[in-house]
Amino acid sequence: MMTGTIETTGNISAEKGGSIILQCHLSSTTAQVTQVNWEQQDQLLAICNADLGWHISPSFKDRVAPGPGLGLTLQSLTVNDTGEYFCIYHTYPDGTYTGRIFLEVLESSVAEHGARFQIP
């Protein structure tokens, strides 16, 4: 039985050229996190493996920084970065939990953060 929930930063916005932290948190479960995958659509951004550490996809190696924690910092944002991002938690024995973040990259100098929300 999967009892955990993923809390994410929800819908967020950031300025073009700036950076943003993508963050998820798994709670309400004692399952062991073995790996967290960060994806945009079906495209890999990065993996944080409990034993092996971080692997950054070639497509993002010049502008993704690991962390903080299991999160991901996306730098030098462009409008093409607008879209859905997923944190996929591989856990034992529960299985896989997925959280969703929607990022909007704005041309303007005003970028407001959305509210946090949960995905069971």
Partner: antibody, heavy 120, light 107 residues
């Protein structure tokens, strides 16, 4: 020493599916990506995609989505690639290769290749 | 996708020669380039990664250089076992793509 041993050549009929294997020895199987590469005469080498055997995380070249499916069996240190709905365009030599986990973006050891012939 | 072009598909040289194989990318790839050797029997080996780093066990007569869109592999003193096809591959972003290969033959 690191070795990748691939299954033998296959002669398949159009429309069928085939599963090619790649057995890894000489290193910790779960800790490295297995890459799959296609080689057709006159078409050079084409990257199909990759799987991280420890978690089963797999990523595909857009061109091969729906055609190739990767799996891995940690108990036998073997990676598999299934190709479906075969056509003559799938006739090729297929290679598996190793890419170390982390920021190592090169295929440092290769299998000997598996020749697939699709013919009615 | 980034296109990798090896304009010379085949090259003939004499033993002891210095041979240079070139590769160009359709856009800048920031030195994110590898070179592989494929022997006539199909065996593939990594030679050079990140433009100029020699993979372990590869003879020092192999070297790589380049920047931006243009890269090259040099064999300083051609030996019989170097008869093979050589491929460049970028890893600037996915999908990885390879050049069409340069087949090296002995005169």
């Amino acid at each position: 020493q690191v070795q990748l041993q691939q299954s033998g050549g296959e002669l398949m009929k159009p429309g069928a599916s085939v599963k090619i294997s790649c057995k890894a020895t000489g290193y910790t199987f779960s800790n490295c990506w297995i890459e799959w590469v296609k080689q057709r005469p006159g078409h050079g080498l084409e990257w199909i995609g990759e799987i991280l055997p420890g978690s089963g995380s797999a990523y595909y070249n857009e061109k091969f989505k729906g055609k190739a499916t990767f799996t891995a069996d940690k108990s036998s240190n073997t990676a598999y690639m299934q190709l479906s709905s075969l056509t003559s365009e799938d006739s090729a030599v297929y290679y598996c290769a190793r890419q170390k986990y982390g920021n190592y973006y090169y295929f440092d050891y290769w299998g000997q290749g598996t020749t697939l012939t699709v013919s009615s | 996708d980034i296109q990798m072009t090896q304009t010379t598909s085949s090259l003939s040289a004499s033993l002891g020669d210095r041979v240079t194989i070139s590769c160009s990318a359709s856009q800048g790839i920031s030195n994110y380039l590898n070179w592989y050797q494929q022997k006539p029997d199909g065996t593939v080996k990594l030679l050079i990664y990140y433009t100029s780093s020699l993979h372990s066990g590869v003879p020092s007569r192999f070297s790589g250089s380049g920047s931006g869109t243009d890269y090259s592999l040099t064999i300083s003193n051609l030996e019989p076992e170097d008869i093979a096809t050589y491929y460049c591959q970028h890893y600037s972003k996915l999908p990885y793509t390879f050049g069409g290969g340069t087949k090296l033959e002995i005169k």
